[in-house]
Amino acid sequence: YHGCPSECTCSRASQVECTGARIVAVPTPLPWNAMSLQILNTHITELNESPFLNISALIALRIEKNELSRITPGAFRNLGSLRYLSLANNKLQVLPIGLFQGLDSLESLLLSSNQLLQIQPAHFSQCSNLKELQLHGNHLEYIPDGAFDHLVGLTKLNLGKNSLTHISPRVFQHLGNLQVLRLYENRLTDIPMGTFDGLVNLQELALQQNQIGLLSPGLFHNNHNLQRLYLSNNHISQLPPSVFMQLPQLNRLTLFGNSLKELSPGIFGPMPNLRELWLYDNHISSLPDNVFSNLRQLQVLILSRNQISFISPGAFNGLTELRELSLHTNALQDLDGNVFRMLANLQNISLQNNRLRQLPGNIFANVNGLMAIQLQNNQLENLPLGIFDHLGKLCELRLYDNPWRCDSDILPLRNWLLLNQPRLGTDTVPVCFSPANVRGQSLIIINVNVAVPSVHVPEVPSYPETPWYPDTPSYPDTTSVSSTTELTSPVEDYTDLTTIQVTDDRSVWGMTQAQSG
């Protein structure tokens, strides 16, 4: 193949690959017709003048995962056909000015995972056809104005995993064709107003894992084509009312891991394409009416691991397509009976790890398609009569780790659970907390005999059986939402003497090993 160096492999398709620790310089002679050259995992420490002079047809050059720390300015001379150049995963601290001069066809330049301390406008001034520039994983502390001014065709710019503490509002102003901008894992504390105004074609903006505390109200107002906005793991404590108002194409928004304390009504919207909204790990304490009302197509709403203690009855208005609602690990004590009324398509609701002490009888009244309900680790003592009767698709119900009060009032629930045991899972079953003499006994096993001295023996109402569908898919624990409202008495008062008999054959009921939470 026109003279392949012994340290390399050359294919008929004009592809050359040179790998191995024994290589300490660019191998020679390289086949003159090579179109793709890869130099990987070698001990090359520097590139001298014109090592690729005789392979002017080269289209792709990958020099990755080497010990490369120094490059002579003329190293890439005579590579006018080169479209793809990767110098990723080396030890470069400095780029010589003029290094990319003459690379008139270059479309992709990968400089990621080096030790670059700075870039200058002169570095990329010759790269007018560049479409992709990868600078992530370096040690850049600032980007000077003009650094990207000549890259008018750029569509993808990755500056993630650097040490940027601030961004000039002018640095991206000429990048009208940019579609992807990644600034994740830096040390940005704020983004100046106007920074993204020139990015009219931007589709993805990644700002996660910075230290951003405040978002300017009009920060995204010119980014009408934005589809993915990542703001998670910052220090954002509040959202300006209009900050998301001009993002009609948005289909992914992450805000988890911030310090949000409240969400104002209409803050999200209109976003007809948004399918998922991740708000876990914030400090949200309440949800007002209509806070999500513009998110008509939302299917997943994750609000777990906040401090939510109050949910307004109309908080979930408009979420007619919602499939999964996660409210677990909050501080909910009460839920209004109508709070989930609009969620006609809800399949999975997570309310575990809250402080719910009771649930209203109509809490799931209009949510007929529920398949999974997580209610474990609350403070429920009983549940209202018939609360699950209409949930024909329910195949997973988690009720363990609640302080169930196993007096005569528990009979309807106990009877329903007996008939619907497969839904409860096998590893953990609900156990009684009170009275003390039955503490720890399975709520399903326990036998409550009600002795009535009078001739008239009232019929004990039981939860009607809901058939269990074994072919319905089982959903894993996801997230939880919790809150309660008025306590609906599950059965009529029993004034008679109650005696409780207990069976202790726990192994029959799968109580040998508790499932970890």
Epitope: Q333, N353, R357, L487
Partner: antibody
């Protein structure tokens, strides 16, 4: 007879981790929750967390990132794992349960405690 | 988190006299549906583990002498020892469980 016995305390270097055990007898961990509470010398009580019968856990929010409570039902043992220890974690560590009380978060049976000292 | 503030820090009372300890919560501990105040009182004698005395603000734990009583609702609570005995010398703690538990700073009761 209900008993809770803590072990695993001792001297730990700052930045290190500890794993305390609470061996219980007289009741089953599949039926009762177990809390961890600590008390620095001459100071007040601080609730750390709880593991319930079914394995769910709750933690003190200020310590959550450094705490893990787990258990082995078959061994009748509950564990407290704490990472990134600092001098302020020096304390007596107790485990406790709700044996008779009607208060779900009440702690009416306590161990005698195990002392943890964080110092270089 | 709910902050529990006890007063006084220490209290010296003559044998047979009444001792009163106050506990104030930063948030109401009354659940309007269950109509319970989620407040408990613990006693810790020198060198011993704590002991649960009272829960739901006023319900005495079984075996606790009736000289101990709890009162209050919402954010203000009181533990009263109607006739102090020598064996009551201890530190007393209030604890809320409306949210995840937090203890008060403690009140030391001594004999005058």
């Amino acid at each position: 007879e209900v008993q809770l016995v803590e072990s695993g305390g001792g001297l730990v270097q700052p930045g290190g981790s500890l794993r305390l055990s609470c061996a219980v007898s007289g009741f089953s961990l599949t039926s009762y929750g177990v809390h961890w509470v600590r008390q620095a010398t001459g100071k007040g009580l601080e609730w750390l967390g709880v593991i319930w019968a079914g394995g769910s856990t709750n933690y003190n929010s200020a310590l959550m990132s450094r705490l893990t409570i787990s258990k082995e039902n078959a061994k009748s043992s509950v564990y407290l794992q704490m990472n990134s220890l600092r001098a302020g974690d020096t304390a007596m560590y107790y485990c406790a349960t709700h044996m008779i009380t009607e208060d779900y978060y009440g702690m009416d049976y306590w161990g005698q405690g195990t002392t943890v000292t964080v110092s270089s | 988190d709910i902050v529990m503030t006890q007063s006084p820090d220490s209290l010296a009372v003559s044998l047979g006299e009444r001792a009163t300890i106050n506990c104030k919560s930063s948030h109401s501990l009354l659940n309007s549906r269950t109509r319970k105040n989620y407040l408990a009182w613990y006693q810790q004698k020198p060198g011993q583990s704590p002991k649960l005395l009272i829960y739901w603000a006023s319900t005495r734990e079984s075996g606790v002498p009736d000289r101990f009583s709890g009162s209050g609702s919402g954010t203000d609570f009181t533990l009263t020892i109607s006739s102090l005995q020598a064996e009551d010398v201890a530190v007393y703690y209030c604890k809320q469980s409306y949210n995840l538990p937090t203890f008060g700073g403690g009140t030391k009761v001594e004999i005058k």
